[in-house]
């Protein structure tokens, strides 16, 4: 199993949204791939699950682009805000 | 969930002002989006008009800036639309929408302005 | 302001076969690593509803027959295969400058 997240750092401007990309390699049948935010602190803070059998994922100003086939799972963050500053993983599940 | 409705007259008199309401259920509009007019004409043109922001900010198409205003009211989650010397070009469905910059997603149902004498 | 041209204005589509429309700006409106493109659906009396956004991300609940692609000037809104449901316009919409624009719309048909 491989998780990769190839942005190290992406800069933008409040109120906008970006996209944040992750690829991953995995041999189960069903997975869940999470995304979680990186507090200064290094807490984890869980934003949003994507099922592997299920439609694209959303939850309040985060929304999953989910493309099974090409093994992508991308998170957008839409409303942009000062707090939205941090470090995001996704991580792979089963 | 998030839901738009605008009210506001069906019929307005050319030079006259049109004023619109839209009611926010489901999410406080200071909580970090746009909030946004657009309009729909009889030929099937949209535009944009407006926004006021979370924090109050506003931002009018330079097509309209003379005639428009956009205000809210954070406290009954209304915000509103103000267009002033109306003209039977401004004949339009008016929506209401919300914005964070992956589109709009969510839509008042809209409501049809007819600018008649 | 960004000029948003849609082709065709009109298209018949065969039920099952694939609808391709493009929609190209007057100049990019790519920015910070985004391509600030979205497209909607709209029927008569209806609130267009959003079906792509930034270029080619699928709205939640939107179905995979919906796709979207292209960078900077130049996009495309593909449906394939084409149901009997998809008779409606479609817009794109660009919010990377103010003011936002829309395209004129692209009506189709099913055949």
């Known amino acids: 199993q491989k998780v990769t997240q190839a942005q190290s750092s992406v800069s933008m401007p409040v109120r906008k949204a970006v996209t944040l990309n992750c690829l991953y390699e995995t041999s189960w049948w069903s997975y869940y791939i999470f995304w979680y935010k990186q507090l200064p602190s290094k807490e984890m803070i869980f934003l949003i699950r994507q099922g592997s059998d299920e439609q694209n994922a959303k939850s309040g100003r985060y929304s999953v682009n989910f493309k099974k086939a090409a093994k992508s799972v991308a998170l957008t963050i839409s409303a942009l805000q000062l707090e939205d500053s941090a470090k995001y993983f996704c991580a792979l599940g089963e | 969930d998030v839901q738009l409705q605008e009210s506001g007259p069906g019929m307005v008199k050319p030079s006259q002002s049109l004023s619109l309401t839209c009611t926010v259920t489901?999410?406080?509009?200071?909580?970090?989006?746009?909030w946004h007019w657009i309009r729909h004409f009889p030929g099937n043109k949209l535009e944009w008009m407006a926004y006021?922001?979370?924090?109050?900010?506003?931002d009018y198409n330079p097509s309209l800036k003379s005639r428009i205003s956009v205000t809210h009211d954070t406290s009954k989650n209304l915000f509103f639309l103000n267009l002033t010397s109306v003209t039977t070009e401004d004949t339009a469905t008016y929506y209401c929408?919300?914005?964070?910059?992956?589109?709009?997603?969510?839509w008042g149902q809209g409501t049809l302005v007819t600018v008649s004498a | 302001n960004i000029v948003l041209t849609q082709s065709p204005a009109s298209l018949a589509v065969s039920l099952g076969q694939r609808a391709t429309i493009s929609c190209r700006a007057s100049?990019?409106?790519?920015?910070?690593?985004?391509?600030?493109m979205h497209w909607y659906q709209q029927k008569p009396g209806q609130p267009p509803k959003l079906l792509i956004y930034?270029?080619?991300n699928l709205e939640s609940g939107v179905p995979a027959r919906f796709s979207g692609s292209g960078s900077r000037t130049d996009f495309t809104l593909t449906i394939d295969p084409v149901e009997s449901d998809d008779a409606a316009t479609y817009y794109c919409?660009?919010?990377?400058?103010?003011?936002?624009?829309f395209g004129s719309g692209t009506k189709l048909e099913i055949k």
């Open positions: 100049e990019s409106v790519d920015g910070y690593g985004n391509s600030f």
């Open positions: 006021i922001s979370y924090s109050g900010s506003t």
């Open positions: 930034l270029a080619s």
């Open positions: 919409q660009q919010n990377n400058e103010d003011p936002f624009t």
């Open positions: 929408a919300r914005e964070g910059g992956r589109g709009f997603a969510y």
């Open positions: 489901g999410y406080s509009i200071t909580g970090g989006y746009d």
